[in-house]
């Protein structure tokens, strides 16, 4: 029978008695930076080329005895998970291994850097097809390791890394915290986050997605035909490296941004039991389990978006938090969230020639998050239109006035500390979907975009009685680009997008009276691109 | 541990040279920063990655590394350049005393310095 992990990542249409999806990643080369490996294991024989690269520290302890099978165990297993004949994800992928971890599974940041440099030089000397680099290791936060990963990613290499097995915020570890790297957490057969001894998978905003990482049967270095179960975020990352190899083999021109968006899009949504994560990390941690796309082609028509959370701003009065999209992505909307509810909103602003999303803390607030909605929108021309606070009692409003520009997101930012506490709610005038409406004391920012065939619509869901959470989702074929709360709901903690659903969170309802001020309205902006759909049909 | 003495035999005791002047003092207003792992047991003091500014050429990296060795030698310190980076990041890996960090941070082209640290199989 198919091992549980391969079944989990396989779309139903591929599920047969044997796991044999089309095209096994044969156009892709996967580099593995790990322990030494047993390259003559029947699972990976002829598939893995052991490079002459080795940079490892001495083993600790005077009584340590090097035993080949122990030295090779981690790397052999991972090579098998990526491309193994029987238990591999991308059975056609070829691999190259670099030894950066010693027999105890320990390495150094400097050794890893030199390994990444070796890959870059190899790429320059002999350019091949798409490259995936698997980094099944973690250390403390390292500016230099993250910088090296960024450079390699900008050279067109896809880096996949383990989130870490420390049951902690992945942002505290490297390379997991590097934004350019695809960071993978681990789940088990019950779609629970993996527990490992007293610890377990890392979590948080630096994790891109999860993948099977417990009780994974793969090649064992004990003998050339042996198999063994291993667990960890390394195993999870190896699944995603294999999926990435499959996707890149089917579409070799995919950029890192496109690949990441596809990985997110085709993941299983909302299957992880979030109760395992610390309460303050649940909203930040993606509830996504990686899966292969149902077909290798035809995803190009979709408008892909993802949600990017900033680091926490910290509690000082003027503290701000910034969320950024990847270089190839467009920032289509910006929202903010504060657990205390004390915030001064958010705004989109230019930074280094690119739009970023900045959230503002308020006096007495415990801090804010900025939430960017980052999308793939080819040939897009986006700008931000701002209206300063209005004098009129009807509130502030701004719309997209340029010909052919559509509204993709609304943000509002205010200087007064407790906006809306004593003010009547502002009602959105009906029949004006292409504008953002806000409090008269807030400046309102509209994200307006022009792109071939782009069309957007506003969708609202209001609840008259107070509720801790109000949601509104975009229907099939439409993608959520903007998520905000209708002004006038003073107890709103913030708004954010989860997959294709706009979530507006409010303070604990027990503290709020059920007056009209208790009303909460979630506003979603849903878009689609007819141009992308047509282009896709023409290809087929 | 057995290799340690051997390693130090190879260390270069660089002599004072014409390169040890102030011809390329760091630009005004830019201060290089020092970083180290927040998890103490994972720190590897004595080995440092010196990261140079983005557009630094390989020849400048080598020259900066030699300058560090020369200036360290004048103060009676042994240093060893373990690797010169180019291709991804400009810089070099150096084995030296932590006492020399202040000196290294003032070298021309230096963006930041990071103490080496451990990484682990996950």
């Amino acid at each position: 029978s198919i091992p549980w992990n391969l079944e989990r990542i396989t779309p139903p249409r591929y599920r047969a008695d044997e796991y044999q999806p089309p095209d096994g990643g044969s156009l892709v080369e996967v580099y593995l930076l790990d322990t030494s490996i047993q390259s003559d294991h029947r699972e990976i024989e002829g598939r893995v080329m052991v490079t002459d690269f080795e940079n490892v520290p001495e083993e600790d302890g005077t009584r340590f005895h090097r035993q080949a099978s122990k030295c090779d165990s981690h790397g052999t297993h991972l090579a098998g998970v990526v491309s193994g004949r029987d238990a591999g994800v991308a059975k056609g992928a070829s691999m190259r291994s670099l030894r950066v971890l010693n027999c105890q599974g320990k390495g150094t940041v400097s050794g890893t850097l030199i390994g990444l440099e070796f890959i870059r030089k190899s790429q320059l000397v002999q350019p091949v097809g798409p490259l995936v680099v698997l980094l099944p290791l973690a250390g403390g936060y390292s500016r230099v390791l993250n910088a090296a990963c960024q450079r390699l990613a900008r050279a067109g290499v896809v880096l996949v890394t383990a989130a870490g097995n420390f049951r902690d915020d992945a942002c505290l570890y490297s390379p997991a915290s590097a934004p350019e790297v695809i960071t993978v957490g681990a789940t088990n057969a019950q779609d629970q986050p993996v527990t490992l001894g007293t610890l377990g998978t890392n979590f948080g905003r630096c994790v891109d997605l999860f993948a099977p990482g417990e009780d994974i049967i793969g090649a064992s270095s004990d003998c050339s035909t042996c198999f063994v179960s291993q667990s960890g975020t390394s195993q999870a990352a190896a699944h995603v490296a294999g999926i990435a190899a499959m996707m890149l083999s089917a579409e070799p021109e995919l950029t890192l941004a496109e690949l990441r968006q596809r990985l997110i899009h085709f993941s299983a949504k909302d299957v992880i039991n979030e109760a395992w994560f610390p309460e303050d990390q649940r909203v930040l941690t993606p509830n996504l389990v990686a899966a292969l796309p149902p077909s290798t082609h035809g995803a190009g028509w979709q408008l892909f978006c993802r949600t990017v959370w900033s680091a926490h701003s910290g509690p000082t009065r003027m503290a701000t938090a910034v969320a950024r999209c990847a270089p190839d992505e467009e920032l289509l909307s910006c929202s903010s969230f504060s657990r205390s509810g004390k915030r001064r909103g958010e705004r989109m602003e230019a930074q280094g020639g690119k739009l970023v999303c900045r959230a503002h803390n308020a006096f007495g607030g415990e801090g804010v998050y900025a939430i960017a909605r980052c999308c793939l929108l080819p040939q897009a021309n986006c700008s931000v239109h701002t209206a300063p606070p209005a004098e009129a009692s009807m509130g502030t409003r701004v719309h997209c006035h340029q010909q052919g520009h559509v509204l993709t997101g609304c943000s509002s930012h205010w200087e007064v500390e407790d906006l809306g506490t004593h003010k009547p709610p502002v009602l959105r005038p009906r029949g004006q979907p292409n504008q953002c409406v806000g409090h008269r004391e807030a400046s309102i920012h509209a994200s307006c975009c022009h792109a071939p065939g782009l069309e957007c619509k506003v969708k609202e869901h209001g609840i008259p009685a107070p509720q801790e959470q109000v949601t509104v989702a975009c229907e099939e074929g439409w993608t959520l680009t903007g998520c905000s709360a209708l002004p006038g709901t003073s107890h709103v903690l913030g708004a954010y997008a989860v997959d294709n659903t706009c979530v507006v969170r409010s303070r604990d309802v027990s503290t709020t009276g059920s007056t009209s001020e208790g009303a909460v309205t979630a506003v979603a902006i849903c878009c689609r691109s007819r141009h992308l759909a047509q282009a896709s049909q023409e290809l087929q | 541990q057995e290799d340690e003495d051997g390693d130090y035999e190879e260390l270069v005791l660089a002599l004072r040279s014409e390169e040890d002047g102030l011809a390329e003092a760091p630009e005004h207003g830019t201060t290089a920063t020092f970083h180290r792992c927040a998890k103490d047991p994972w720190r590897l003091p004595g080995t440092y990655v010196v990261v140079l500014k983005e557009e630094t050429h390989l020849s400048q990296s080598e020259r900066t590394a030699r300058r560090l060795q020369a200036q360290a030698a004048r103060r009676g310190y042994l240093t060893k350049i373990l690797h010169v980076f180019h291709g991804l990041l400009p810089g070099f890996l150096v084995k030296m005393s932590g006492d020399l960090l202040e000196l290294a941070l003032k070298l021309p082209h230096v963006d930041y310095i990071e103490e080496d640290s451990s990484v682990f199989a996950q």
Epitope: G105, N165, G197, L199, I216, S220, V228, S229, S231 | -
Partner: antibody
Framework: EVQLVESGGGLVQPGGSLRLSCAAS????????MSWVRQAPGKGLEWVAN????????YYVDSVKGRFTISRDIAKNSLYLQMNSLRAEDTAVYYC???????????????????????WGQGTTVTVSS | DIQMTQSPSTLSASVGDRVTITCRAS??????LAWYQQKPGKAPKLLIY???SLESGVPSRFSGSGSGTEFTLTISSLQPDDFATYYC?????????FGQGTKLEIK
Amino acid sequence: EVQLVESGGGLVQPGGSLRLSCAASGITFSSYWMSWVRQAPGKGLEWVANIKQDGSEKYYVDSVKGRFTISRDIAKNSLYLQMNSLRAEDTAVYYCARDRGTYYYGIGSYNYYYYGMDVWGQGTTVTVSS
Amino acid sequence: DIQMTQSPSTLSASVGDRVTITCRASQSISSWLAWYQQKPGKAPKLLIYKASSLESGVPSRFSGSGSGTEFTLTISSLQPDDFATYYCQQYNSYSYTFGQGTKLEIK
């Protein structure tokens, strides 16, 4: 279907020897630790011994150390228990079982995470009596 | 060696009842605990591993909890098929010990 089938049980005199076998089918035999567990008539379960995937590590309950030897033949998908110097208190039904567990890395250490015995044979009876 | 003590030794209950069996370890075993069900003349069957993880194919009325030294097996609504003997088992450094068993019988 995953199956374990024990054989080799029987009546033996105290001080005698027996060799139990366990044939595995439908499982990747070499992927798992394997155990022998026994159950004396009317009593509870007692773990006897286990062996690593490649046979390189073996562990025994104190009462059988030096008398029993666990081994495996990966090529034959078989597990064995050689029992010497048998005593009356060794009388029991002997089960072979698959130990399900997983390895994971800690900070510079390689650890085993045990789940439980998820596949069992039907048992073979050993009677030690004069 | 770590000793495992199960209580009660015998438990009488009726179909539909919620029953709890306790297992105590003589020293901390973290979550290294499994629960088994055994019917007369049959081999044991794994129900719960890692103290609280349900083995695949086992009905969801079975649940496990606890860590350290105190563990419980709960059957939320007893079914006729559940009358059997239940064993807990600890794992420590590649050696195992079982509890003495709890016989669950019809009241």
